[in-house]
Amino acid sequence: QPDAINAPVTCCYNFTNRKISVQRLASYRRITSSKCPKEAVIFKTIVAKEICADPKQKWVQDSMDHLDKQTQTPKT
């Protein structure tokens, strides 16, 4: 779970160790604040749960790619 200390800075201290199916993901945001111990990705699932993930992992990178392509493609 992301942890908001002195909002609005949200940090991740631990990453999920489970790969999440891309079908369960709705969006993501990058955590890059130098106030945080590490850069991270926070995925938001289709049930609005937020999950911290390691941006160095290939499945995380692939999921971000998928979401970015999906966001830009107009939904018909």
Epitope: K38, E39, P55, K56, T71, Q72
Partner: antibody, heavy 117, light 107 residues
Framework: QVQLVQSGAEVKKPGSSVKVSCKAS????????MHWVRQAPGQGLEWMGR????????KFDPKFQGRVTITADTSTSTAYMELSSLRSEDTAVYYC??????????WGQGTTVTVSS | DIQMTQSPSSLSASVGDRVTITCKAF??????RAWYQQKPGKAPKLLIH???SLEHGVPSRFSGSGSGTDYTLTISSLQPEDFATYYC?????????FGGGTKVEIK
């Protein structure tokens, strides 16, 4: 706060090599990627490559492949960039920068490398 | 490599002016672009990354927009400290590439 401090200016002969260091403070380099970007006098920015200090995995612009070596020492939080077979066109300011996503949140102050006979 | 074409290469403007810099990628980069500001003798400074993410401490007069291959940096009201060179960069795929830069000068 995050700081990247680079080694001093270098003057090199054509054909020789140069090794530039970048010491990080305020962050654990194994949590990020360390990149090298250069800028020739009066010119734009050119990405050279990056290292994941956690596993020493590297990625380079094919233009520099074989001529550049990027290493990192997590025990001293230092990244290094070595460029070999120097030519006059390599005269530039060399920057280290950090960022896991492919953009660069923090930069070193730059190291001027002059290649001249 | 994904080529990034930035325009104009230079512009003259006055304090208070609205300034727009454009960047065109030679293929879709899905909003994965960053904007940097660089002053003479200094390292570049990250302003914006991704769709709209303004870096911490960057004034709200800076904004980014665009999608697909076309992106824009807007400075809504130019301040004296904004005279500098601006670069766009794509981070959709390595090798990461930069635009040629736009030098914003005092009119």
């Amino acid at each position: 706060q995050v700081q990247l401090v680079q080694s001093g200016a270098e003057v090199k002969k054509p054909g020789s090599s140069v090794k530039v260091s970048c010491k990080a403070s305020g962050l654990t380099i194994s949590h990020t990627y360390m990149h090298w970007v250069r800028q020739a006098p009066g010119q734009g920015l050119e990405w050279m490559g990056r290292i994941d200090p956690e596993n020493h995995n590297t990625k380079f612009d094919p233009k520099f492949q074989g001529r550049v070596t990027i290493t990192a020492d997590t025990s001293t939080s230092t990244a290094y960039m070595e460029l070999s077979s120097l030519r006059s066109e390599d005269t530039a300011v060399y920057y280290c920068a950090r960022g896991v996503f492919g953009f660069f949140e923090h930069w070193g102050q730059g190291t001027t490398v002059t290649v001249s006979s | 490599d994904i080529q990034m074409t930035q325009s104009p290469s230079s512009l003259s403007a006055s304090v208070g002016d609205r300034v727009t810099i454009t960047c065109k990628a030679f293929e879709d980069i899905y909003n994965r672009r960053a904007w940097y500001q660089q002053k003479p003798g200094k390292a570049p400074k990250l302003l914006i990354h991704g769709a709209t993410s303004l870096e911490h401490g960057v004034p709200s007069r800076f904004s980014g927009s665009g999608s697909g291959t076309d992106y824009t940096l807007t400075i809504s009201s130019l301040q004296p400290e904004d005279f500098a060179t601006y670069y766009c960069q794509q981070f959709w795929s390595a090798p990461y590439t930069f635009g040629g830069g736009t030098k914003v000068e005092i009119k």
